[in-house]
């Protein structure tokens, strides 16, 4: 069962796995959640009654019964991991800790104007896990305004001590705020010859890459496939690092694959969720339970529902044996990966889906789209919403996109003349406008947040957020779309679609069925030539056919320009402005969402 509250002056007895240092009990809970085995923890706060060497210790614990005896102890704070919870979890920690020095390897020292600048530096440095910044009030003159970037093997401090006039904090890479490049390519027949920081067993290079991504020290990896000549190294995933942050040597070797940590793309692709099944593959590990199951899918469900289960192997039933049920072996290990992977024994293996909630909901695969035609089908664009105004009469005003369970991203120009959020209604999961009746459920709007630099659509900053009064429960017909990663700025999107209920031609009427059009992106240079009277800035993106005929139009405003990249849909643009509708040689101009990721996160993550 999910227990989120912390237990003050309480210590869990026994079950210790490891001890780490964290600046708060709240962060200890996050570390426990992300640890492959931790189910409970005990954190020691600073206290005069406690030995200072025990301050800030976070003891990660496990228990077969999922609980441990409680003992009263002053300054101890205990709790449970979020593994047992169904809600979305994130490792993002923006807190700044005053008068705390988080110890680690100080590998970079430089002057910074503020703690924020120091944190940004850490976020954009490939090695940095956390930082300590000496403020201008720091007693030692030569250390004032010094920003120390730090890393450790575990990603958490090796010790935390009290130190006046310093502040510490963590890298915001896990908040999608890094400007580091997002390199998704996996290089076949390649070995990266750099130092290994760890090795695990993985069924394929994709799982290896995802393991590298959430391993604190891993920057790139090499995976030896099951055809690798050296038997003892088959399915081996080598997690690697280097001083420069890049592989120093690439060696051509067949049956090996290499790639990079996806830490700069983790908000727009799954990095925890290993959802595939591996046929004729057995995963070895500590056995947790053996249960009868009808199929490998049912076995995966059983593993997902058993909080300690990390992976499984299913052996299908022999003929009519056991009511057609096979054996489902629920397993675990110290690091969450199989201790060995065997092939040719007929098993079907896979991983728990419990970790999927650590990934952004937007990375969930949606049902295959219908190719061709202009009318959409239900569930094809589950992030698309229709924004209605009720004044003077109810009508479709603009499109918008679900980007979080309480957030809609749309265009600022939609709110010209809108005096209050009270007159707005957001309808999600809608295909036809005619579905909207008096009693159709909608989301009220609590707040309209318009970019403060917005003046008019053509000048840019045409972006707005709607904070909903209630949260959206994600289903197949209403779910979020991923924001593009800042590390993806150089990606060339080739599968882009504009959707909306807008006019199909100038002086038309709003369409009943959600329309879709596949449109290519146009370079800003090319676009600028078409719009000589407007500055096409890097904060805008253009799309449209040379021959015209497909474009966004009035009523599509605020809606998404959605592009599919690596099987995940990204909100690349917001329909903003353009000349007419599908005018030949006049591409549509969209707000370039990647340039506003910081603004979006600042507004949506504000406490």
């Amino acid at each position: 069962e999910c227990v989120t509250q912390l237990l003050k002056d309480t210590c869990f007895e026994g079950g210790d796995i490891t001890t780490v240092f964290t600046p708060s009990a709240k962060y200890c809970q996050v570390v426990c959640t992300y640890h492959p085995r931790c189910l409970l923890f005990t954190f020691t706060a600073e206290s005069p009654s406690e030995d200072p060497t025990r301050w800030f210790t976070c003891v990660l614990k496990d228990s077969v019964t999922e609980t441990l005896p409680r003992v009263n102890r002053t300054a101890a704070i205990s709790g449970y991991s979020f593994k047992q919870c169904s809600h979305q979890i994130s490792a993002c920690n923006k807190d700044i800790y005053v008068d705390l020095d988080m110890k680690g390897i100080n590998y970079n020292s430089s002057v910074a104007k503020s703690a924020q600048e120091c944190q940004e530096r850490c976020t954009d440095d490939v090695h940095c896990h956390f930082f300590t910044y000496a403020t201008r009030q720091f007693p030692s003159l030569e250390h004032r305004n010094i920003c120390l970037l730090k890393h450790t093997q575990t990603g958490t401090p090796t010790r935390i001590t009290k130190l006046d006039k310093v502040v510490s904090g963590f890298s915001l890479k896990s908040c999608a705020l890094s400007n580091l490049a997002c390199i998704r390519d996996i290089f076949p027949n390649t070995v990266f010859a750099d130092s290994n920081i760890d090795s695990v067993m993985a069924p394929d290079a994709f799982v290896c890459g995802r393991i590298c991504t959430h391993h604190p020290g891993c920057l790139f990896f090499t995976f030896f496939s099951q055809e690798w000549p050296k038997e003892s190294q088959r399915n081996l995933c080598l997690l690697k690092t280097s001083e420069s942050g890049l592989p120093s040597t690439r060696i051509k070797k067949s049956k090996a694959l290499s790639g990079f940590s996806l830490q700069s793309c983790r908000h727009s692709i799954p990095v925890f969720c290993h959802s595939s099944f591996y046929h004729d593959t057995d995963f070895l590990g500590e056995e947790l339970d053996i249960v009868a199951a009808k199929s490998h899918e049912a076995c995966q469900k059983l593993c997902t529902n058993a909080v300690r289960c990390q992976f499984f192997t299913y052996t299908p039933a022999q003929a009519s044996c056991n009511e057609g049920k096979g054996k489902c072996y629920l397993k675990l290990s110290s690091n969450g990966s199989p201790t060995k992977i065997l092939h040719g024994r007929g098993g079907i293996s896979g991983y728990t889906l419990r970790l999927c909630k650590m990934d952004n909901e937007c990375t969930t695969k949606i049902k295959p789209r219908i190719v061709g035609g202009t009318a959409s089908v239900r569930g094809e664009w589950p992030w698309q919403v229709t924004l209605h105004t009720t004044s003077p009469t109810q009508r479709h005003l603009c499109g918008g996109s679900i980007i979080g369970n309480q957030w809609i991203l749309t265009a600022a120009h939609c709110f010209y003349g809108v005096e209050s959020p009270k007159i707005l209604r957001v309808y999600s999961g809608i295909l036809n406008q005619s579905e909207i009746k008096e009693d159709t459920s909608f989301f009220g709007v609590q707040e309209i947040i318009i970019h403060d630099q917005y003046k008019m659509a053509e000048s840019g900053y045409d972006i707005a957020l709607l904070k909903l009064e209630t949260t959206v429960n994600y289903t197949d017909s209403q779910r979020p779309i991923c924001l593009p990663s800042k590390g993806d700025r150089n990606v060339i999107y080739t599968d882009c679609w504009v959707t909306g209920w807008g006019y199909r031609k100038l002086r038309d009427k709003i369409q009943n069925t959600l329309q879709k059009a596949k449109i290519p992106l146009v370079t800003n240079e090319e676009c600028q030539k078409r719009y000589r009277g407007h500055k096409i800035t890097h904060k805008m993106i253009c799309a449209g056919y040379r021959e015209g005929g497909k474009d966004a139009c009035k009523g599509d405003s605020g809606g998404p320009l959605s592009c599919k990249h690596n099987e995940v849909w990204h909100l690349v643009g917001i329909t903003s402005w353009g000349e007419g509708c599908a005018q030949r040689e006049r591409p549509g101009v969209y707000t370039n969402v990647v340039e506003y990721v910081d603004w979006i996160l600042e507004k949506t993550q504000a406490v």
Partner: antibody, heavy 120, light 107 residues
Framework: QVQLVQSGAEVKKPGASVKVSCKAS????????IEWVRQAPGQGLEWIGV????????NYNENFKDRATLTADTSISTAYMELSRLRSDDTAVYFC?????????????WGQGTTVTVSS | DIVMTQSPDSLAVSLGERATINCKAS??????VAWYQQKPGQPPKLLIY???NRYTGVPDRFSGSGSGTDFTLTISSLQAEDVAVYFC?????????FGGGTKLEIK
């Protein structure tokens, strides 16, 4: 009705500057672009640049980039074109025109033209 | 820059006869072509935009055609008041450029 009225003829010496005005009426000044085009005696038409009075954004022909300055005063619906470091080959009739499309297109209304003579 | 080459430089046509003026672009300009008429001492006047769309108040004896790089202005039955210089213009790519002009006279 839409009208663009330009300032009167100018005679200038080489090296000097000239500023031509173009007063718009009969439409919303900030909703259309103002283009500047010149025509040397017996010659064709040459585009100088464009100003968007709504945003103040200007875009120049490379040939005029370092000598022409386009401005607009929205309070009096007037656009200006200033050409500096005049040469004798700048002798021409200078026209302002409104674009047919909001974002740059055919020029549907023209001013009557301002003759600029550059002579020592 | 895109070069617009007009032909012929001058043309003499009898009253009531058809006059045809051609314009060739140095690269494809899609449908972003306009035609203007200019009489002595006057500014140019828009006749045709987007290749073939007649501007408000333009008589229907004026028509435009073409695609890609080759465009034509046709006056189906020449009138005395049509004596003027005619210019084509591309609006496909900045900077907009004009043809050198065709002087139309009565034969």
């Amino acid at each position: 009705q839409v009208q663009l009225v330009q300032s009167g003829a100018e005679v200038k010496k080489p090296g000097a500057s000239v500023k031509v005005s173009c007063k718009a009426s009969g439409y919303t000044f900030t909703n259309y672009l103002i283009e500047w085009v010149r025509q040397a005696p017996g010659q064709g038409l040459e585009w100088i640049g464009v100003i968007n009075p709504g945003s103040g954004y200007t875009n120049y022909n490379e040939n005029f980039k370092d000598r022409a300055t386009l401005t607009a005063d929205t309070s009096i619906s007037t656009a200006y074109m200033e050409l500096s470091r005049l040469r004798s080959d700048d002798t021409a009739v200078y026209f302002c025109a409104r674009t047919y499309g909001k974002y740059g297109g055919a020029m549907d209304f023209w001013g009557q033209g301002t003759t600029v003579t550059v002579s020592s | 820059d895109i070069v617009m080459t007009q032909s012929p430089d001058s043309l003499a046509v009898s009253l009531g006869e058809r006059a045809t003026i051609n314009c060739k672009a140095s690269q494809s300009v899609s449908n972003d072509v306009a035609w203007y008429q200019q009489k002595p001492g006057q500014p140019p006047k828009l006749l045709i935009y987007y290749i073939s769309n007649r501007y408000t108040g333009v008589p229907d004896r004026f028509s435009g055609s073409g695609s890609g790089t080759d465009f034509t202005l046709t006056i189906s039955s020449l009138q005395a008041e049509d004596v003027a210089v005619y210019f084509c213009q591309q609006d496909y790519s900045s900077p907009p450029t004009f043809g050198g002009g065709t002087k139309l006279e009565i034969k």
